[in-house]
Amino acid sequence: TPEVWVQVQMEATELSSFTVHCGFLGPGSISLVTVSWGGPDGAGGTKLAVLHPELGTRQWAPARQARWETQSSISLALEDSGASSPFANTTFCCKFASFPEGSWESCGSLPPSSDPGLSAPPTPVPILRADL
């Protein structure tokens, strides 16, 4: 069964900078990746970026740079302009769409214990419930 992993990390040098890494583990070629925060897109979450393997990327503030890392993984750099750091308690969700297999999505957040600059381990949280 395909899976999606989500990893959120805080940059060591800039505590206001975060990076979300997402990857797809499974067969099929990825047609589209949607990244959102505050929950899944369509379920109260806000879209941050949409990445297409051929047509490029679209991103919305506070997303700074969305890019493909491999054919099945992406990264999204975020700039937190606020004094406090709301990203630290935020859920980030990634949805990978593969044709004709379908879509898989997962959410993750910065682990509370993680030190700045240390890469948080992948924390996949498969979305199985409709009321998230």
Epitope: S29, G42, S98, F99, P100, G102, L128, R129
Partner: antibody, heavy 120, light 107 residues
Framework: DVQLVESGGGLVKLGGSLKLSCVAS????????MSWIRQTPEKRLELVAA????????YYLDTVKGRFTISRDIAKNTLHLQMSSLKSEDTALYYC?????????????WGQGTSVTVSS | SIVMTQTPKFLLVSAGDRVTITCKAS??????VAWYQQKPGQSPKLLMY???NRFTGVPDRFTGSGYGTDFTFTINTVQAEDLAVYFC?????????FGGGTKLEIK
Amino acid sequence: DVQLVESGGGLVKLGGSLKLSCVASGFTFSSYHMSWIRQTPEKRLELVAAINSNDINTYYLDTVKGRFTISRDIAKNTLHLQMSSLKSEDTALYYCARHEDYYGFAMDYWGQGTSVTVSS
Amino acid sequence: SIVMTQTPKFLLVSAGDRVTITCKASQSVSNDVAWYQQKPGQSPKLLMYYVSNRFTGVPDRFTGSGYGTDFTFTINTVQAEDLAVYFCQQAYRSPWTFGGGTKLEIK
């Protein structure tokens, strides 16, 4: 303007074969996923076969696996559905459709359909 | 495969009425739901994608909502030209599946 025009339907004997074609125009055919959808006499819609824009990944409805083959000819902007060992339950109106990545794979354009009747 | 249960099967309404069609998925399909309109003698036409996004040229009297398993399609102020069969469809997991359709008739 995006256009999809199907042809090749007709009356065929039980166990016979038929090849449906769909000529696409108004868009870059090679960049889109395509599919064949049929509408049964009861007006139910079923996705019969689909092909990724990479022409590698395909999908077939369980009941047509091993009997139907979806393919495309990029040079001729044409989608095909080769149907063999036809059964009475294959009687339907067959549509070709384009899938849009940015619309969650919704089928944003459909052809006018071609009718297939399998008789005993 | 995911079953899309669409209700009602038939709707008889007057022009100007508000119409609601529901679609229930047998498991979560996220927001990967589309709605199509099929007028008599025509092929289906895309109306809504990602539940609530209107396709190009679709009037704003058509709206959609829902997430997960429960979806609603609404026509505010039905017009005579809305006479058609409406289908929901999920594209979350292969095989893509359609609802059974709702036939809208105008009094």
